[in-house]
């Protein structure tokens, strides 16, 4: 079972992931982003359910498409290049979800815009942070 220190580490990692996702959302929602309309045409797969750390498998599988869409944005909207930003997120996601490779993601029937996709995973992080005991 997780110890208080491992739970604290998990919360810190979730907070880091949350900040990264919020930074991306803020960057693409920036009124100066001329590519937003184009970015909104890309469709992302949403997890059928996302309430536990193992469901981060669904986020991991969508990180490559996310990087591709972020490459459309002006780099000045982000502190890091999309490749580095996504790499950082990937490291956190892998640590959080653990090494269980048999867990397969299931997706919702409806696809989402990049804004909806990011908001979903932001909600996920906020929910886990607030209810993890």
């Amino acid at each position: 079972a997780p110890t208080s220190s491992s739970t604290k580490k998990t919360q810190l990692q979730l907070e880091h992931l949350l900040l990264d996702l919020q930074m991306i959302l803020n960057g693409i929602n920036n009124y100066k982003n001329p590519k937003l309309t184009r970015m909104l045409t890309f469709k992302f797969y949403m997890p059928k359910k996302a309430t536990e750390l193992k469901h981060l498998q669904c986020l991991e599988e969508e990180l490559k498409p996310l990087e591709e869409v972020l490459n459309l944005a002006q780099s000045k909207n982000f502190h890091l290049r999309p490749r580095d930003l996504i790499s950082n997120i990937n490291v956190i996601v892998l640590e959080l979800k653990g090494s269980e490779t048999t867990f397969m993601c299931e997706y919702a029937d409806e696809t989402a815009t990049i804004v909806e996709f990011l908001n979903r995973w932001i909600t996920f992080c906020q929910s886990i942070i607030s209810t993890l005991t």
Epitope: A1, K49, A50, T51, L53, K54, E106, R120, S130, L132
Partner: antibody
């Protein structure tokens, strides 16, 4: 056949403690998230706590710090340790299995907790 | 927390009637809605999830629909054993929340 059987309910005084148990069978216990849901007399359903397959635990503000959910995979058992009980904790407590990608798919028959002086 | 507003809170109907129960959610939950049936003194049983898939063994007269923030449980032809209380629930995010319930009574 999936079965969940709760036990441990009873009458307890305000401020007292109680430990509920849920014995599970018919599925690979260690692979699933388990939850406790309660129902006050004449009221609706309220989610109380959950514990995932990695033993991370989740609970709402109403019980956090007072109730602790735990599991013993070797015994196929789920527990709810309830401390500092209040009159408003009086309810039927149900153990439920949370499916990996959907809702609470199987429920126990419930055990009654009464907090009264 | 996500709120679930279920309506009506109670209804009277006859055997053979078509019954519709609705659940309005305060934010989009991407179909992560389930419906449960509960009879007096018994545990809830899972009927519908996701939000239109019937659990194995549930009669075809029960159906679920909806998207976004509005969801519906329909009983196409009410049977004597269907008189019970029905609850919706969101499992999109913790804390899981339930609707207040709809009691279906005999007219």
């Amino acid at each position: 056949e999936v079965q969940l059987v709760e036990s441990g309910g009873g009458l307890v005084q305000p401020g007292g403690s109680l430990r509920l148990s849920c014995a599970a069978s018919g599925f690979t216990f260690s692979s699933y998230t388990l939850a406790w849901v309660r129902q006050a007399p004449g009221k609706g359903l309220e989610w109380v706590a959950a514990i995932d397959s990695s033993s991370y635990t989740y609970s709402p503000d109403t019980v956090r710090g007072r109730f602790t959910i735990s599991r013993d995979n070797a015994k196929n058992s789920l527990y709810l340790q309830m401390n500092s009980l209040r009159a408003e904790d009086t309810a039927v407590y149900y153990c439920a299995r949370d499916s990996n990608w959907d809702a609470l798919d199987y429920w126990g028959q419930g055990t009654t907790v009464t907090v009264s002086s | 927390d996500i709120q679930m507003t279920q309506s009506p809170s109670s209804l009277s109907a006859s055997v053979g009637d078509r019954v519709t129960i609705t659940c309005k959610v305060t934010e989009k939950v991407w179909g992560n809605v389930a419906w449960y049936q509960q009879k007096p003194g018994k545990a809830p049983i899972s009927l519908i999830y996701s939000p239109s898939l019937r659990k194995s063994g549930v009669p075809s007269r029960f159906s679920g629909s909806g998207s976004g923030t509005d969801f519906t449980l329909t009983i196409s032809s009410l049977q004597p054993e269907d008189f019970a209380t029905y609850y919706c629930q969101q499992y999109y995010t913790y804390p899981y929340t339930f609707g207040g319930g709809t009691k279906v009574e005999i007219k």
